[in-house]
């Protein structure tokens, strides 16, 4: 039975040209995290593997930095970065937990963080 929950940074906004940290946290489970994938729509941005550490997809190497923790830092943001981001926790023995973050990249300097929320 999957008892864990993923808490994410929820709906967030940031300025064009700036950077943002995407964060997820898995709690309420003793499952072992094998790997965390960060995905944007159908694209794989990065992997944090329990055995082998971080690997950033070559097409994102210039604008994506690992961390802090299991999070992901997006840099040099463009309006095209607006959209859904997913943290996918592969665990044993529970299976897969997925968290969703919506990022809006704003032209203006008004960029406020949204509320945090949980996904069971």
């Amino acid at each position: 039975m999957m008892t864990g929950t993923i808490e994410t940074t929820g709906n967030i906004s940031a300025e064009k040209g700036g950077s943002i940290i995407l964060q997820c946290h898995l709690s309420s489970t003793t499952a072992q995290v094998t790997q965390v994938n960060w995905e944007q729509q159908d694209q794989l941005l990065a992997i944090c593997n329990a055995d082998l550490g971080w690997h950033i997809s070559p097409s994102f190497k210039d604008r994506v930095a690992p961390g802090p923790g299991l999070g992901l830092t997006l840099q040099s943001l463009t309006v095209n970065d607006t959209g859904e981001y997913f943290c996918i926790y592969h665990t044993y023995p529970d299976g897969t937990y997925t968290g969703r973050i919506f990022l809006e990249v704003l032209e203006s300097s008004v960029a406020e963080h949204g509320a945090r929320f949980q996904i069971p």
Partner: antibody
Framework: EVQLVESEGGLVQPGASVKLSCVGS????????MSWVRQTPGKTMEWIGN????????NYAPSLKNRFTISRDNAKNTLYLQMTNLRSEDTATYYC???????????????????WGQGVMVTVSS | DIQMTQSPSSLPTSLGDRVTITCRTS??????LRWFQQKPGKSPRLMIH???NLANGVPSRFSGSRAGSDYSLTINSLESEDMAMYYC?????????FGSGTKLEIK
Amino acid sequence: EVQLVESEGGLVQPGASVKLSCVGSGFSFSDHWMSWVRQTPGKTMEWIGNIQYDGSYTNYAPSLKNRFTISRDNAKNTLYLQMTNLRSEDTATYYCTRGHFRITMASMGASASVYWGQGVMVTVSS
Amino acid sequence: DIQMTQSPSSLPTSLGDRVTITCRTSQDIGNSLRWFQQKPGKSPRLMIHGATNLANGVPSRFSGSRAGSDYSLTINSLESEDMAMYYCLQHNEYPLTFGSGTKLEIK
């Protein structure tokens, strides 16, 4: 705790066939690539081949691919190595190793081999 | 196949020494190189992955480096528990290939 336990080896005749097995526990076996590696008595390490997490794809060392076959049964958490027409130069300790997690990218490499079994000695001699 | 030329094959050492083992590759493999340690009667243990990254639980006296097609494993201030065989492995392309091994021995 991740564990890989190979079946017992032993003495086999030249020309004979042997099927080794390796049972994995403490991890999601069906989500990982698995490999076989052997080590000769002279301590030379040789990669034999690997198999995709779902068993649909295998790679082999060219010198061994005609005689060795890797397979897996995910329902039993078991990896196999079928060896045929054995020769004296096949005498070695055979290790199964856990490869990378199924959802990965090329930069993580072909086979992680972070976890190894204890090894099983196969001696080919008449 | 990619050839891995590992040297030296044997290295007499003293405790506290700084030790370097090298593998030279016949083709470019990027950073797709791992180092393994093997003690007598034991299975190999991953020490370095990605040419320079320390594996989980490996003491910080171990380090990996790359200079072109030469890859090195360095042990700063050798300890008795480091006496073992060391192997490099390239995983840039199939078939994966190992170096011939280096045996660390007490002088």
